[in-house]
Interface confidence: low
C-alpha cells in the first residue's frame, strides 16, 4: 500500500499511550474535508510494544530506543510515505510516570527525555511526550466514547455500534481502568459541583457539557493487587499469605522489596521478619471481595456523597461505557453481555475462583500464566469497585456497557486526546463548509 | 417466532437490474440493523452490504459498492436490495439477518432467494 | 481489510467423534466473532457469539474458544445433524468477514 495514489485526501495522527504496563501505539485517519465533523477519524491500527510500561526502564533508559523501534516502524508501513511528514505524533503517559514522578521528578523527566529523542529520530512530525494528568486522562476517555458513538452531533454517522443507535444525544459516562489508576467521568444531573477539582466545562460542536471526573491513583488493577498484599501480609503470621483472590492451588513467591518498591504501598509498609513470602491460593471469592473492601475508605466523607477516600462522587446517571482493563477482565470472564445481571456476574466470579489452579491453566492453556493467575483478583476488584466504590446498584448495573472497541477504534482516552490536540473538536457545531474555529477542549 | 423471508429472485440478463425485499416478522424490525449476505454456488458467505435501524448508517463491500443499494421500510418491516448493472458474478444465494450489537449479531437469517445472472 | 482464515476447508469425521475447527483474524477483532452452521438446503444457524457464547437451543456439545487471535469451534461428540458446514464471521468492524468455511462429513 505504500505507493498506492489515495483516493481522496487522507491524513493520520499517531498517538502512543505508555501506560503503566505497557505502550500502546494507535493509528488514526479521517478524511481531510470533514476533519470537524463528529464520528469521521477512526482507527486503522493498533501496536503494542513489547515489553513492560516505559516506567520500568528508568534504570535502562539506553534500551527505550529499541523498545519502540516495532511499532514506529509499524507506523511508517502503514501511513503512505506521502503523509509522514505531515503526521503528528503524541506520546501520553499515564499513572506510571506519575508514580515514578512522585518517588523522582528528575528520574520521570529523564525517561521522558530519552522517549523524546527516540521519537525524533522519525519522519513524522513529532509534537511531544507528556505525563497526562489523571483529569485529562478521565476527560479524554469520556470524549473519544462520545465522539464514536456520535453523540456530540446529529449528522450521520460513518460507523455503526448499533444498541446505542437511538436519537437520545445523552452522553455516556466513561469507567476507564488501567494498571495504576482508574478513572470515572460522566455528566450528573446536577450542574453545580460541590468539588470543583472534580468539574470540567467543555463546550462541543455547540453544546455544553458539565463533566464531572477523578482520576485513582494507585487504584488500578495491578497497583491495587500491590495494595492488597501489602495490607494482607501486615497480618500474616509467617511468610506464608493464604490468598483468597488467587486459585485453590496456585503458588508464587513475592520479594517484599517489590512489595514496597511503588508508593501506592507506603502506607502499607511495615519491617516483616522475612524478605519473600509465598502466596499461596484459596479461591474464594466473598474472602477475597471482603479483603478488596478494606483498600477503600468509606468511613470519612466530607461532601453529600463520596465514592471512596473522602472523594466526592455525584449519583450516578445514564449509561455508561467501561473500558480498557474493565473490558479486558471481564471479556476474558466472558461476562461482558448485556444479558448478564450483576447477580449473574458475581455467581460466575465465585465459581471462577474456586476453580482449581491446575484446572484454570489446562483450560486456558494459551494465556500467560502471569496474567491468568490474576483474573480472580481482577474480576473481584472490578465488582468491588463498581459496586461499593463508585456505588453501581444490581438495577444500575444495566446501564453499564463493557466496550472493547467502537467499531474497530479502541475506547480509551488517546483518541480524545489526539482529537484535541489537532482542533478537530470545534466549539461551535460546524456548518456544511469548513469555519475558522477558536475554541476547543 | 422471528421470521425474515427473502423473494424476488430470478434469472436476469447481465447489465439488467433486480430488487430484492425480505419480509421481517417476530420482533421489533426497527430496533435491528439488518445486513444482506450472499454465496455464489459451491462458494463461501461473502457479505455484501449493512443498513442501521435508523438507515442512517450504511455500509457495502467493495464488490458491490455503486451497484446495489440497501434500503429499507421500518412501517412495512421490509429490507430492500436493489441491485443494478449485474455481472455474472452477482449470481448466488441472497440471505438477509438481523442485528443488534451484543448479542444478537447476525443471529437470525432468512432461507435465501436465488439470483441468476445470465444471457 | 481483516482476513479471516478458516482451517480445515473439509473434515471427514466419524458420530462421537470431537472435532475441532479453527479461525485466525489477521487484525485483533477482541472477541467479535460469531461461528455459523449451515446445513445442506441452505438453512443458516448461528451457533456462537461474542468467540464463546453459545446461543439458546444450541446443544452443549458445541463450544467456542479463544487464543489470542486464533478462535476455535470444538463439537464434542459428533451426531448425524452436525454434518453440516461451517462458518466463523468477524463483526470487530466493517466490512464483515466470512472465513473460507469448513464442509464437515461423515465418514
Known amino acids: 500500500t505504500q505507493n498506492k495514489a489515495l483516493p481522496e485526501n487522507i491524513k493520520y495522527g499517531i498517538v502512543l499511550d505508555a501506560g503503566s504496563s505497557h505502550t500502546s501505539l494507535y493509528i488514526y485517519k479521517w478524511p481531510a474535508e470533514k476533519e470537524n465533523d463528529t464520528g469521521v477519524v477512526h482507527q486503522v491500527e493498533e501496536c503494542r510494544v513489547k515489553g513492560p510500561g516505559i516506567s520500568k526502564y528508568v534504570q535502562k533508559v539506553n534500551e527505550i530506543g529499541i523498545y519502540l523501534t516495532d511499532c514506529m516502524e509499524r507506523a511508517r508501513e502503514v501511513i503512505p510515505r506521502s503523509q509522514h511528514q505531515e503526521t503528528p505524533v503524541y506520546l501520553g503517559a499515564t499513572a506510571g510516570m506519575r508514580l515514578l514522578r512522585m518517588e523522582s521528578e528528575e528520574l520521570a523527566d529523564r525517561v521522558l527525555d530519552v522517549v523524546e529523542r527516540s521519537l525524533s529520530n522519525y519522519p513524522f512530525d513529532f509534537q511531544g511526550a507528556r505525563i497526562i494528568t489523571g483529569q485529562e486522562e478521565g476527560a479524554y476517555g469520556w470524549i473519544t466514547i462520545n465522539y464514536l458513538l456520535g453523540k456530540f452531533s446529529q449528522k450521520t454517522r460513518w460507523f455503526s455500534i448499533v444498541p446505542y443507535e437511538t436519537n437520545n444525544q445523552e452522553t455516556f459516562g466513561a469507567l476507564d481502568l488501567g494498571g495504576a489508576s482508574t478513572q470515572i467521568t460522566f455528566v450528573p444531573q446536577n450542574q453545580t459541583t460541590e468539588s470543583p477539582d472534580n468539574a470540567l466545562q467543555f463546550r462541543l460542536y455547540g453544546k455544553d457539557y458539565n463533566v464531572y471526573t477523578h482520576s485513582f491513583l494507585c487504584y488500578g488493577k495491578d497497583q491495587a493487587l500491590w495494595q492488597k498484599l501489602a495490607k494482607d501480609i501486615q497480618v500474616a503470621s509467617n511468610e506464608i499469605l493464604r490468598d483468597p483472590c488467587f486459585h485453590p492451588g496456585y503458588k508464587k513467591v513475592v520479594n517484599v522489596s517489590d512489595l514496597y518498591k511503588t508508593p501506592c504501598t507506603k502506607r502499607f509498609e511495615m519491617t516483616l521478619p522475612f524478605q519473600q513470602f509465598e502466596i499461596q491460593g484459596i479461591g474464594n471469592y466473598q474472602q477475597c471481595h471482603q479483603s478488596v473492601l478494606e483498600l477503600f475508605n468509606t468511613s470519612y466523607c466530607p461532601y453529600s456523597q463520596c465514592a471512596f477516600n473522602g472523594i466526592f462522587l455525584p449519583p450516578l446517571q445514564g449509561d455508561f461505557g467501561a473500558f480498557s482493563a474493565f473490558y479486558f477482565v471481564m471479556n476474558f470472564l466472558n461476562l461482558t453481555s448485556e444479558k448478564v445481571s450483576q447477580e449473574k456476574v458475581t455467581e460466575m466470579m465465585k465459581k471462577f475462583c474456586s476453580q482449581p489452579w491446575e484446572e484454570i491453566k489446562t483450560s486456558y492453556a494459551g494465556v500467560k500464566e502471569k496474567y491468568l493467575s490474576e483474573y480472580c483478583f481482577s474480576g473481584t476488584y472490578i465488582l468491588s469497585l463498581l459496586l461499593q466504590g463508585y456505588h453501581f446498584t444490581a438495577d444500575s448495573w444495566e446501564h453499564i456497557h463493557f466496550i472493547g472497541k467502537i467499531q474497530g477504534s479502541d475506547a480509551g482516552w488517546t483518541l480524545g486526546y489526539m482529537l484535541n490536540l489537532t482542533n478537530m473538536i470545534p466549539a461551535e457545531q460546524p456548518l456544511s463548509t469548513p469555519l475558522s474555529h477558536s475554541t476547543y477542549v | 417466532e422471528v421470521q425474515l423471508v427473502e423473494s424476488g429472485g430470478g434469472l436476469v440478463k447481465p447489465g439488467g437490474s433486480l430488487k430484492l425485499p425480505c419480509a421481517a416478522s417476530?420482533?421489533?424490525?426497527?430496533?435491528?440493523?439488518m445486513h444482506w449476505v450472499r454465496q455464489a454456488p459451491e462458494k463461501g458467505l461473502e457479505w455484501v452490504a449493512y443498513i442501521s435501524s435508523g438507515s442512517s448508517i450504511i455500509y457495502y463491500a467493495d464488490t458491490v459498492k455503486g451497484r446495489f443499494t440497501i434500503s429499507r421500510d421500518n412501517a412495512k418491516n421490509t429490507l430492500f436490495l436493489q441491485m443494478t448493472s449485474l455481472r455474472s458474478e452477482d449470481t448466488a444465494m441472497y440471505y438477509c439477518?438481523?442485528?443488534?450489537?451484543?448479542?444478537?449479531?447476525?443471529?437470525?437469517w432468512g432461507q435465501g432467494t436465488t439470483l441468476t445472472v445470465a444471457s | 481489510d481483516i482476513q479471516m482464515t478458516q482451517s480445515p476447508s473439509s473434515l471427514s469425521a466419524s458420530l462421537g467423534e470431537r472435532v475441532s475447527l479453527t479461525c485466525r483474524a489477521s487484525q485483533e477483532i477482541s472477541g467479535y466473532l460469531i461461528w455459523l452452521q449451515q446445513k445442506p438446503d441452505g438453512t443458516i444457524k448461528r451457533l456462537i457469539y461474542a468467540a464463546s457464547t453459545l446461543d439458546s437451543g444450541v446443544p452443549k456439545r458445541f463450544s467456542g474458544n479463544r487464543s489470542g487471535s486464533d478462535y476455535s469451534l470444538t463439537i464434542s461428540s459428533l451426531e448425524s445433524e452436525d454434518f453440516a458446514d461451517y462458518y466463523c464471521?468477524?463483526?470487530?468492524?466493517?466490512?464483515?468477514?466470512f472465513g473460507g468455511g469448513t464442509k464437515l462429513e461423515i465418514k
Open positions: 439477518a438481523r442485528d443488534l450489537y451484543y448479542d444478537h449479531v447476525l443471529d437470525y
Open positions: 417476530g420482533f421489533t424490525f426497527s430496533d435491528y440493523g
Open positions: 464471521l468477524q463483526y470487530a468492524s466493517y466490512p464483515r468477514t
